[in-house]
Every structure is written in structure tokens, then in C-alpha cells.
Amino acid sequence: IWSAVFLNSLFNQEVQIPLTESYCGPCPKNWICYKNNCYQFFDESKNWYESQASCMSQNASLLKVYSKEDQDLLKLVKSYHWMGLVHIPTNGSWQWEDGSILSPNLLTIIEMQKGDCALYASSFKGYIENCSTPNTYICMQRTV
């Protein structure tokens, strides 16, 4: 089990995440594997584009929220982190890096600032933010 000290820096309470490879993964070393997704939380603050580049360099993408059930650990995430949601001005939609459109009722979108990027916060909230603002970020790999 991951140590509570490590998890308490990321989550609002202790989260039990089994490390056994047969249940989940494979994931890059030291990443969290949960319900066939790999996650890593990065403490350094970067703008959205640099955060995206960092994730890409690890063959991952910024966090995509696609299922409240499969990603229930995200309910407990502390603070605000860049996720892979971006506003497309040409059609006014919010879409993920993979090109898929944000599904209704997955996230509560809150306009904190004028911007085209979004921060993830606990309980499936998304805060609109200027893409140039430095923030911590979450990378994710979906495993087949």
C-alpha cells in the first residue's frame, strides 16, 4: 500500500491504492495505478503548455476526467492542478487533448478567471484559468 504520508500530500484523506501489478497497469515507475489508469502528480508549477509538454515527454497526457466511477480517487484530490481540458474558440466547446468533447455532468465548470484552460479541483470541479498561469499538474496514462 502507498504510504499515507505520500498520499496525504495529494489527497484530503488516506487513500488505499494497491500496488500489485496484476490488478492494474503497467505504469511508469513511481506512478499511482488505479482502476487501469496511471497517474502522477507534479509539484513544480508550470503553465498549461509546459505542463502538457512535460506529460507528453513521458508518453502521457494531462489528466482526462472520463468516468466518476473509474476515477473516484479524484474526489479527494487536494488543491488545483492543470488537467487536459482546453477551450476551442472556433466552436466554443471544451475538449480533451485526445480530441474528445467534455461530456455533460462529468465536471462542474467554474469560471474563476477568463481563460481557455482548466484546473482540476476535488469533487469533480473544473476551474477556468488563463493558460499562462503557473500551476501544478497531473499527468495520466490510460492503460488498455
Epitope: 502538457q52 509538454a53 515527454s57 480530441g99 488498455v144
Partner: antibody
Framework: GGGLVKPGGSLELCCKA?????????MSWVRQSPGKGLEWIGR?????????AYASWVNGRFTLSRDIDQSTGCLQLNSLTAADTAMYYC?????????????WGQGTLVTVSS | DIQMTQSPSSVSASVGDRVTITCRAS??????LVWYQQKPGKAPELLMY???TLQSGVPSRFSGSGSGTDFTLTISSLQPEDFATYYC?????????FGQGTKVEIK
């Protein structure tokens, strides 16, 4: 620019971007041999040369670089063989559109022959 | 590396026909799938990304579907300017790989 190169020779291809913020996109290179399909060579991030990736077949023969002030990306080709004869395209990699190549240069033909 | 396999390699069709091209990935790529159109002597052009999202300016007769390993590009009513070669590409992981292409020819 492209042109005729002898086997074992070297060549540098460069591409200048305009009309968008170079620092937030990636530049990639894709080649197409005569009558053949498309082959990805590698990518470099406009904002930082720390982030690069190459196709495994490149085997260290090719090197990507970029100059953020000039909004230019370059591909250095070394130890060329006849199999490297192709049209070489510089392309903008859009990481927010499924990592698609959304803008393509006109291409430059590299011919490797003695 | 992820292999992308397109079928058919070529198709003969007439103006007004419905044309379907398939692309299969050797492993699941979710919806990280892109389609391009290339005309002779020209660079490829982006048609669609996210398996089904049309690039701005692309006519609505083009549509895409699929997720995971199997994807389809459909041209609902072929127009003279659609005779070209079509390529799929996966953006799920590096190295990014392309299908071998499908040439749509005039019958």
C-alpha cells in the same frame, strides 16, 4: 533546403514558422519516400529543446533543434543512405488535437545517390 | 511500436458514391486517431482528429467513428475533389505511426 547528397553525407533542413506562437507547439518532421507512405521522424517542443523524441529507426543519425527567437526548427541528417531518399516535411504537431499534424510545410526533396 | 493497418489499399468509386475506409491499430489507442487527405504532388492535409472531430473547414460529408482499435472514415457522397489518398495516424504514443494509405480512384 534539400537536394542531392552522396551516400554517407550530411544535410541540414530548416523550417521557419509564422502565424502562431512557436513556443507552445511542437515541431515534427515526417518523410515520404517516392510512391510510399508517411513516416514520422521525431518531434521537438517549441518552448524547450529538453523535450524531444525520435522514431527508433533514426538510430542517432538525425538530430532535431530549434531556435525560439527565430521560430525555426531544423533537422540535421547524417550518415545518409539511398533509403533516406524522400520528401521531408516539417509539420506543426498540435498536442491538443489528438497530437495531429495540423499544418504542413511544402516539403523538400532529399535525394541520396552517388 | 503501434502498427496501423488500413483497408482497402485502394478503392474505385464514382461521384456520389458512399466510401468507407477502415483503420485498425495493433493495440488500443482510445480516440487518439487522426485522418489526413493527400492529393498528388501536395502535402497531406488534416481532415479529422479525435477519431470523429472534423478539422475546421472540412465538409460535413466526411465523418469518422471508432474507439480502441477499430476506426472508420466515411465519405457520404463522393465529390470530384475527394479523389485522393487517405491516411490514418495514431497520436496515443510515440513513435507516432501512420497507416499505409488508401487511394480513392475514379471508377
Amino acid at each position: 533546403g534539400g537536394g542531392l547528397v552522396k551516400p554517407g553525407g550530411s544535410l541540414e533542413l530548416c523550417c521557419k514558422a509564422s502565424g502562431f506562437d512557436f513556443s507552445i507547439y511542437w515541431m515534427s518532421w515526417v518523410r515520404q519516400s517516392p510512391g510510399k507512405g508517411l513516416e514520422w521522424i521525431g518531434r521537438i517542443y517549441g518552448g524547450s529543446s529538453d523535450y524531444t523524441a525520435y522514431a527508433s529507426w533514426v538510430n542517432g543519425r538525425f538530430t532535431l533543434s530549434r531556435d525560439i527567437d527565430q521560430s525555426t526548427g531544423c533537422l540535421q541528417l547524417n550518415s545518409l543512405t539511398a533509403a533516406d531518399t524522400a520528401m521531408y516535411y516539417c509539420v506543426r504537431l498540435n498536442p491538443s488535437f489528438s497530437r495531429s499534424f495540423d499544418y504542413w510545410g511544402q516539403g523538400t526533396l532529399v535525394t541520396v545517390s552517388s | 511500436d503501434i502498427q496501423m493497418t488500413q483497408s482497402p489499399s485502394s478503392v474505385s468509386a464514382s461521384v456520389g458514391d458512399r466510401v468507407t475506409i477502415t483503420c485498425r491499430a495493433s493495440q488500443g489507442i482510445f480516440s487518439w486517431l487522426v485522418w489526413y487527405q493527400q492529393k498528388p504532388g501536395k502535402a497531406p492535409e488534416l481532415l479529422m482528429y479525435g477519431a470523429s472531430t472534423l478539422q475546421s473547414g472540412v465538409p460535413s460529408r466526411f465523418s469518422g467513428s471508432g474507439s480502441g482499435t477499430d476506426f472508420t472514415l466515411t465519405i457520404s457522397s463522393l465529390q470530384p475533389e475527394d479523389f485522393a489518398t487517405y491516411y490514418c495516424q495514431q497520436g496515443y504514443s510515440t513513435p507516432y505511426t501512420f497507416g499505409q494509405g488508401t487511394k480513392v480512384e475514379i471508377k
